[in-house]
């Protein structure tokens, strides 16, 4: 039996509106019906939870209403979008996947996606 491998892109550049999207793909060792996906941010060896969602296979991901994340799932692939990012949020974003049900439980952790966020230059005042 193989460990659960989680793949995600190495680098993503956020848009000028502070939105970053990436795919988190996992190779499931079992036939899970309930999957939990968590996005973690690692900066200066500190790890914090950005957002998390549990979904039933075939259904949509449901993040909390106040979450900065949205996402869709297709098979063993999750498309994640993080919004409201600023330059200070630049860091390594790790995709963590847990197969919750049915047993046995499995955990898989990606190597992380380095998200670069550049704050847009403020627009100069125009005189008309």
């Amino acid at each position: 039996c193989k460990a659960m491998h989680v793949a995600q892109p190495a680098v993503v550049l956020a848009s000028s509106r502070g939105i970053a999207s990436f795919v988190c793909e996992y190779a499931s060792p079992g036939k899970a019906t309930e999957v939990r996906v968590t996005v973690l941010r690692q900066a200066d060896s500190q790890v914090t939870e950005v957002c998390a969602a549990t979904y039933m296979m075939g259904n949509e991901l449901t993040f909390l209403d106040d979450s900065i994340c949205t996402g869709t799932s297709s098979g063993n692939q999750v498309n994640l979008t993080i919004q409201g990012l600023r330059a200070m949020d630049t860091g390594l974003y790790i995709c963590k996947v847990e197969l919750m049900y049915p047993p046995p439980y499995y955990l898989g952790i990606g190597n992380g996606t380095q998200i670069y966020v550049i704050d847009p230059e403020p627009c100069p005042d125009s005189d008309f």
Epitope: V47, Y105, L107, G108, I109
Partner: antibody, heavy 118, light 106 residues
Framework: QVQLQQSGPELVKPGASVKLSCKAS????????INWVKQRPGQGLEWIGW????????EYNEKFKGKATFTVDTSSSTAYMELHSLTSEDSAVYFC???????????WGQGTTLTVSS | DIVMTQSHKFMSTSVGDRVSITCKAS??????VAWYQQKPGQSPKLLIY???TRHTGVPDRFTGSGSGTDFTLTISNVQSEDLADYFC????????FGAGTKLELK
């Protein structure tokens, strides 16, 4: 700093039940699973299971199903493990440990010594 | 269950030596392995996670390596305070621990 403070030693009679506690401080209690681990004298470590304080969901080692029950009180940031129908085989040190976001048990309580004897 | 096998129950060393403690998983666990140090009468302390990442405050003489099924904890320049029990643990599935290796003086 992260701390897990466990209840004191227990001496109980065979057949009885006991409830051990683990009070967390220094972090957001509801964001991390609490695991329970058994260690018999001179022996290795045996995972009993975990509880997720946010929703109370649990996972148990098959061997401890029916033997251990986990609960939490989020208002006091305390996790509990109740052990049932005690026998001498349950005499051990029991540790609670926080499960880090990346999976390992990153902080441990000092342990509670349980002695089951008539 | 995934079985973690630490083939050496005891390992003898001297202060200043370099020692390697090994651990083998019964199936592929990727890099989801941690190492703990436990001294008599104390709780275990996390040293290494993700097979090779040092936990906060752990001296850099402790290094972890390996992936798949074979893992190693290496202590270079062993200090007297390093004499303890060392446990490996996988967390790819329900957590399981190795039986432990006691590091003692020659």
């Amino acid at each position: 700093q992260v701390q897990l403070q466990q209840s004191g030693p227990e001496l109980v009679k065979p057949g009885a039940s006991v409830k051990l506690s683990c009070k967390a401080s220094g972090y957001t209690f509801t964001s991390y699973d609490i695991n329970w681990v058994k260690q018999r004298p001179g022996q290795g470590l045996e995972w009993i299971g975990w509880i997720h304080p946010r929703d109370g969901s649990t996972e148990y080692n098959e061997k401890f199903k029916g033997k251990a029950t986990f609960t939490v009180d989020t208002s006091s940031s305390t996790a509990y493990m109740e052990l049932h129908s005690l026998t001498s085989e349950d005499s051990a040190v029991y540790f609670c440990a926080r499960r880090g976001l990346l999976g390992p048990l990153d902080y441990w309580g000092q342990g509670t010594t349980l002695t089951v004897s008539s | 269950d995934i079985v973690m096998t630490q083939s050496h129950k005891f390992m003898s060393t001297s202060v200043g030596d370099r020692v390697s403690i090994t651990c083998k998983a019964s199936q592929d666990v990727g890099t989801l392995v941690a190492w703990y140090q436990q001294k008599p009468g104390q709780s275990p302390k996390l040293l290494i996670y993700w097979a090779s990442t040092r936990h906060t405050g752990v001296p850099d003489r402790f290094t972890g390596s390996g992936s798949g099924t074979d893992f190693t904890l290496t202590i270079s320049n062993v200090q007297s305070e390093d004499l303890a029990d060392y446990f490996c643990q996988q967390y790819s599935s329900y957590p399981t621990f190795g039986a432990g290796t006691k590091l003692e003086l020659k």
